[in-house]
C-alpha cells in the first residue's frame, strides 16, 4: 500500500474576487475520521481553525468560512468570504489536517500563487511547513543517518520512478483557478517532483482514535474508504512518517483516559488522530 | 474524565443581564467549539450559539443576536454565556455542551420574575 | 432554518415491546458529496441535560444499548427501540446536525403502558 498524501488547493472565484474555494483531500486507503482547516499555518502551530469537519457527527465552521462540506467520502471544500478590499486571503496559507485510521493524522498547506492571472492556471506551489519539532525527538545524529538512509532510497527509486500522476482539478469554467497544489507523502521526493511537499505532519495511529479536542473512542463500527489513486501507487518508504514530525501533546497527555472507555470517548492529545468517533454533523 | 462544570441557578430581573459559567476538564479546552442550549420549563431544546476558545471565533441563533455574547477564557478553561434584556420567556434552563453535543454541563436554570 | 417534526408527540408502550419515533426534516440531511445523513437522537430525564444516542441517522454512541436504532435517510428518519425497559422512559429528541443553526425537534415523550 502507498503512503498517504494530503492535497490542498486553493481557487479564487471569477464571479467573485473576493470569494476564494479551499478544496482539500486524502489519498490513501485510510477512513477519515475528521478533517481540520486552518489558515495562517498548521492546526496547532500558529494556525487558526476555519473548520472541522467530522464525517458523521457533522461540520463546524467559523468566520470568514462560509461553507464547509464533503464533496466525496475523502475529499472537502470549504468557501470563504473575504470581505476585506485588501483580499487577505491571497497570500494567506491553507492547511487541512486529515485525521483517518490506521494512518494516522497528516497534514498540508497551500496558498494562492501571489501572481495568478485570471484565467490562468499557476502552477502548483506547495507550502512545505515540515515542523521542528521531531529533530528534537531524533537528535542531530537520528537526523542524519535517517537523510542518509532516504538519500540511498532516492537513488533507488529514481530506477523505478513511478507514472506522475494528474493533479485533481476541482476547476470550472467559472473560476480563474490560482491553485496551490500541496501533495503530502512521506515516500514521495522532492528532488524528483518539485511541486512535492514531505508529508508537513504525522501523527503515527494508536490503538486509542481520537475526537478533534482530544477525546478519542476505538472504532466501532468500520467505516472503509475507498482507495485513491496513490495508495495503488506502492513505492518503497524507510519508515512510515520517519521524516514527519510528530505533533506537539503526543506525548504529554497520551495515558489520559477519560469518559468511557471501551468503545466510547476517550481523551487524547492535541494529535488528533487516527480515528475519531465516527459520526456527527454535517455541513454547517 | 471529561466534564462540563456549570454555574449555579440564578434569578434575575426583567431586563438585567445573566452570565452562566461553564468549566470544563479533561480535555483540550481549546480544540473544539462550546455550545450553548436553552431549554424552556416543559418546553424542547433551542441552539444559541457556540464559541471555538482556542480563536474566540463565534456563531450565534439568528434570534438570539444582539442579546447573547458567547465568550471564553482559555486560562481557566472556562466558557462564558451572557444574555441581556431578559424577558420572562428567557426562564430556562441553559446547558453548555461541547463536542457536537456528546458532552453536556448539568445545567443553570435562570429565573425572570419581577 | 431547518424545521424538525417529530411524530409522535407521545407514546406509551408495553414493557419488551417495540417504540417507534419518527422524525421528518423540512430539508434533506443527506449530504451527496459522502452519502451520510446528518442526523442526531438524544434521551433526556427529568432533571438531567440530554443524553447523545444516535448520530450519522444509524450510529449507535459509545454504551448506548443495541436495543436502540436509527434509520432513515433524506428527511424521514426513525428511532426504534426494540424491546422497551423501564429505563427508558424519557423524552426523546431529533436533531438536525446538516446546517447551522443546529434545531431539534419538539421531542416524544415515551412512557410505559
Known amino acids: 500500500a502507498g503512503t498517504p498524501e494530503v492535497w490542498v488547493q486553493v481557487q479564487m472565484e471569477a464571479t467573485e474576487l473576493s470569494s476564494f474555494t479551499v478544496h482539500c483531500g486524502f489519498l490513501g486507503p485510510g477512513s477519515i475520521s475528521l478533517v481540520t482547516v486552518s489558515w495562517g499555518g498548521p492546526d496547532g502551530a500558529g494556525g487558526t481553525k476555519l473548520a472541522v469537519l467530522h464525517p458523521e457527527l457533522g461540520t463546524r465552521q467559523w468566520a470568514p468560512a462560509r461553507q464547509a462540506r464533503w464533496e466525496t467520502q475523502s475529499s472537502i471544500s470549504l468557501a470563504l468570504e473575504d470581505s476585506g478590499a485588501s483580499s487577505p486571503f491571497a497570500n494567506t496559507t491553507f492547511c487541512c489536517k486529515f485525521a483517518s485510521f490506521p494512518e494516522g493524522s497528516w497534514e498540508s498547506c497551500g496558498s494562492l500563487p501571489p501572481s495568478s492571472d485570471p484565467g490562468l492556471s499557476a502552477p502548483p506551489t506547495p507550502v512545505p511547513i515540515l515542523r521542528a519539532d521531531l529533530a528534537g525527538i531524533l537528535g542531530l545524529s537520528g537526523v542524519l543517518l535517517f537523510g542518509c538512509g532516504y538519500l540511498l532510497h532516492l537513488l533507488r527509486r529514481q530506477k523505478h520512478r513511478p507514472t506522475p500522476r494528474l493533479q485533481p482539478s476541482h476547476t470550472n469554467s467559472q473560476a480563474l483557478t490560482a491553485q496551490a497544489w500541496a501533495p503530502s507523502q512521506a515516500s514521495q521526493a522532492a528532488l524528483h517532483d518539485p511541486y512535492a511537499t514531505i508529508n508537513t505532519s504525522f501523527c503515527p495511529a494508536t490503538l486509542d482514535t481520537a475526537h478533534p479536542n482530544g477525546w478519542a473512542s476505538l472504532p466501532t463500527h468500520a467505516a472503509h474508504q475507498p482507495q485513491g489513486p496513490a495508495a495503488s501507487a506502492s513505492t518503497p518508504i524507510l519508515a512510515r512518517g520517519s521524516f514527519v514530525s510528530v505533533e506537539n501533546g503526543l506525548y504529554t497527555q497520551a495515558g489520559e483516559r477519560p469518559p468511557h472507555t471501551g468503545p466510547g470517548l476517550t481523551l487524547f492529545p492535541d494529535c488528533r488522530g487516527p480515528r475519531a468517533l465516527e459520526g456527527r454533523f454535517g455541513v454547517r | 474524565e471529561v466534564q462540563l462544570v456549570q454555574s449555579g441557578a440564578e434569578v434575575k430581573k426583567p431586563g438585567s443581564s445573566v452570565k452562566v459559567s461553564c468549566k470544563a476538564s479533561?480535555?483540550?479546552?481549546?480544540?473544539?467549539?462550546i455550545e450553548w442550549v436553552r431549554q424552556a420549563p416543559g418546553q424542547g431544546l433551542e441552539w444559541m450559539g457556540e464559541?471555538?476558545?482556542?480563536?474566540?471565533?463565534?456563531n450565534y441563533n439568528e434570534k438570539f443576536k444582539g442579546r447573547v455574547t458567547i465568550t471564553a477564557d482559555e486560562s481557566t478553561s472556562t466558557a462564558y454565556m451572557e444574555l441581556s434584556s431578559l424577558r420572562s420567556e428567557d426562564t430556562a434552563v441553559y446547558y453548555c455542551?461541547?463536542?457536537?453535543?456528546?458532552?453536556w454541563g448539568q445545567g443553570t436554570l435562570v429565573t425572570v420574575s419581577s | 432554518d431547518i424545521v424538525m417534526t417529530q411524530s409522535p408527540d407521545s407514546l406509551a408502550v408495553s414493557l419488551g415491546e417495540r417504540a417507534t419515533i419518527n422524525c421528518k426534516s423540512s430539508?434533506?440531511?443527506?449530504?451527496?458529496?459522502?452519502?451520510?445523513?446528518?442526523l442526531a437522537w438524544y434521551q433526556q430525564k427529568p432533571g438531567q441535560p440530554p443524553k447523545l444516542l444516535i448520530y450519522?441517522?444509524?450510529t449507535r454512541e459509545s454504551g448506548v444499548p443495541d436495543r436502540f436504532s436509527g434509520s432513515g435517510s433524506g428527511t424521514d428518519f426513525t428511532l426504534t427501540i426494540s424491546s422497551l425497559q423501564a429505563e427508558d422512559v424519557a423524552v426523546y429528541y431529533c436533531?438536525?446536525?446538516?446546517?447551522?443553526?443546529?434545531?431539534f425537534g419538539q421531542g416524544t415523550k415515551l412512557e410505559i403502558k
Open positions: 436533531q438536525n446536525a446538516h446546517s447551522y443553526p443546529p434545531t
Open positions: 464559541i471555538l476558545p482556542g480563536s474566540n471565533s463565534t
Open positions: 479533561g480535555g483540550t479546552f481549546s480544540s473544539f467549539s
Open positions: 450519522g441517522a444509524s
Open positions: 455542551s461541547s463536542y457536537w453535543f456528546a458532552y
Open positions: 430539508q434533506s440531511l443527506l449530504n451527496s458529496g459522502n452519502q451520510k445523513n446528518y
